[in-house]
């Protein structure tokens, strides 16, 4: 790869060549490595505090990982002429704590964006839509990777983190063309209502390693193209009939439910019945009960209705303290 620090001499066929400089400037930013043939620029682990201004126009793949960018302002990648070919942008692990509205404007070919492993205390509602219009121009994004973007507790804003992320995903209906969304490892307690309704093209949704307790208020009905739904490593206790019916109604979906603390009581009966007949759940034979204690490690597929009871709730007059 070429870099700003590399040098090469002038053409070998001129015996009188006096200059040791290359005939054309390198067009690779300082602290970066560039490959014209791969159309790739890598500025990785260089403690950059801002996006290089002199990015080459040919860049399709830009890696800005492992830096110290802190803030991504509006128009952070806007150039004249624009970076018209930039298709994949990886900003993971660059200590971003603020992504402002319009940060990714003027990138007409941007299909994949990775903001993972940045403690985003502030994600503007207009980070991806670029404007505050009720319906904005469609974003070209097809893949949006937002794994582990939750900030530490002391850096959180007053509003819910889930709400902040949801607002950015639905603003202006800009992400209607999104096929892949990764939201793993974000301590989500819930998925805000109506988010998925605004993402009708989703094929892959990763919500693994969060703290989701219930999907009761989440609707998957619109996600007719969904192929993979990752819900592993959450805090799910049971899936209720409405959710089961919606998942069963999706024509291509595969659902991943491993490592959830399933509560195997009377409320689990419908889910067990569904699991036994569905082809939707991958690795369904690995799903085991976590509660109550007497059911711990029992395989869900091996349960029958007699196993799934609820302790009777005593009338108040008979309860003792």
């Amino acid at each position: 790869t070429s870099s700003a620090s590399s040098s090469s001499s002038s053409a070998p066929f001129l015996a009188s060549a006096a200059s040791a400089q290359p005939p054309l400037p390198d067009q690779c930013p300082a602290l970066c490595e560039c490959s014209e043939a791969a159309r790739t620029v890598k500025c990785v682990n260089r403690n950059l505090t801002e996006v290089p201004t002199d990015l080459p126009l040919y860049v399709r793949n830009l890696f800005l990982t492992g830096n110290q960018l802190a803030v991504l302002p509006a128009g952070a990648f806007a150039r004249r002429p624009p970076l018209a070919e930039l298709a994949a942008l990886n900003l993971s692990g660059s200590r971003l704590d603020e992504v402002r509205g319009g940060a990714f404007e003027h990138l007409p070919s941007l299909r994949q964006l990775d903001l993972s492993h940045n403690p985003l205390a502030y994600l503007s509602p207009f980070a991806f839509s670029g404007s505050n219009a009720s319906i904005s121009a469609p974003s070209p994004l097809v893949e949006l990777i937002l794994n582990h973007i939750v900030p530490p507790d002391d850096k959180r804003q007053n509003r819910s983190f889930e709400g902040m992320v949801a607002a950015a995903l639905v603003a202006g209906r800009a992400l209607q063309g999104l096929h892949l969304l990764e939201l793993a490892s974000n301590h989500f307690l819930y998925l805000p209502r109506d988010v998925l309704a605004q993402l009708p093209s989703l094929r892959y949704l990763d919500l693994s390693n969060n703290s989701l307790v219930s999907l009761t208020y989440v609707s998957f009905r619109n996600l007719t193209h969904l192929e993979s739904l990752h819900l592993e490593d959450n805090a799910l206790k049971v899936l209720h009939n409405g959710t089961l019916a919606e998942l069963q109604g999706l024509p291509h979906v595969r659902v991943f439910l491993d490592n959830n603390p399933w509560v195997c009581d009377c409320h689990m009966a419908d889910m067990v019945t569904w699991l036994k007949q569905t082809g939707v759940v991958q690795g369904k034979d690995r799903l085991t009960c976590a509660f109550p204690e007497k059911m711990r490690n029992r395989v869900l597929l091996e349960l029958n209705s007699a196993d799934l009871d609820c302790d009777p709730i005593l009338p108040p007059s008979l309860q003792t303290s």
Partner: antibody, heavy 119, light 108 residues
């Protein structure tokens, strides 16, 4: 020091084929496009095509499709061009040249391989 | 394809004289993708002016380039004997890259 070292001159009969080489050194071969250019005696330069050694993509000038075949051997940082069904019109000097897509300009040229087609 | 026509085909100048050669394209070219090369007898071409007006490394300051759209020019403010060469223009507005027919500069 960037160098593009080409194979020696050839004299061939009409209808024959010839394969010439261009060995690159002094830079990362896989990171830059390699073009080929023809210069006929007393005539201008004609762009034959370009090879992307990273992706394997080849783009030919329509005029040279079926006449020229571009290949590379990444392990030896060498580009090749084969010319087929040669006629006297194909006589000339053929140069490999590194194409900089930052500008779509050529920054380094080989010394050229002279091809003479004669019966 | 975008055809480039250079004029004059041959020009002769005295040392110290100012000379200008032109290159016209059949369709518009981005200024960043228009270039000039110098080729001396028996040698390979060298990129001489890139992106319309920028001098390549080692090119004397008496050379300059200008133009936009379909009309471009190369000027030598004060010709010297070492400038004897053929100058080719080249453009990219999508493949194929094309070259002009060349302007041969001679010294009187």
């Amino acid at each position: 020091e960037v160098q593009l070292q080409q194979s020696g001159p050839v004299l061939v009969k009409p209808g024959a084929s010839v394969k010439m080489s261009c060995e690159a050194s002094g830079y990362s071969f896989i990171d830059y496009y390699m073009s080929w250019v023809k210069q006929s005696r007393g005539r201008s330069l004609e762009w034959i095509g370009v090879f992307n050694p990273y992706s394997g993509e080849i783009i030919y000038n329509q005029k040279f499709k079926g006449k020229a075949t571009l290949t590379v051997d990444k392990s030896s940082s060498t580009a090749y061009m084969e010319l087929s069904s040669l006629t006297s019109e194909d006589s000339g000097v053929y140069s490999c040249a590194r194409l900089r897509i930052s500008y779509y300009a050529i920054d380094y040229w080989g010394q050229g391989t002279s091809v003479a087609v004669s019966s | 394809e975008n055809v480039l026509t250079q004029s004059p085909a041959i020009m002769s100048a005295s040392p110290g004289e100012k000379v200008t050669m032109t290159c016209r394209a059949t369709s518009s070219v981005s200024s960043g993708h228009f270039h000039w090369y110098q080729q001396k007898s028996g040698a390979s071409p060298k990129v001489w002016i890139y992106s319309t007006s920028n001098l390549a490394s080692g090119v004397p300051a008496r050379f300059s380039g200008s133009g936009s759209g379909t009309s471009f020019s190369l000027t030598i403010s004060s010709v010297e004997a070492e400038d004897v060469a053929t100058y080719f223009c080249q453009q990219y507005s999508g493949y194929p890259l094309t070259f002009g027919g060349g302007t041969k500069l001679e010294i009187k």
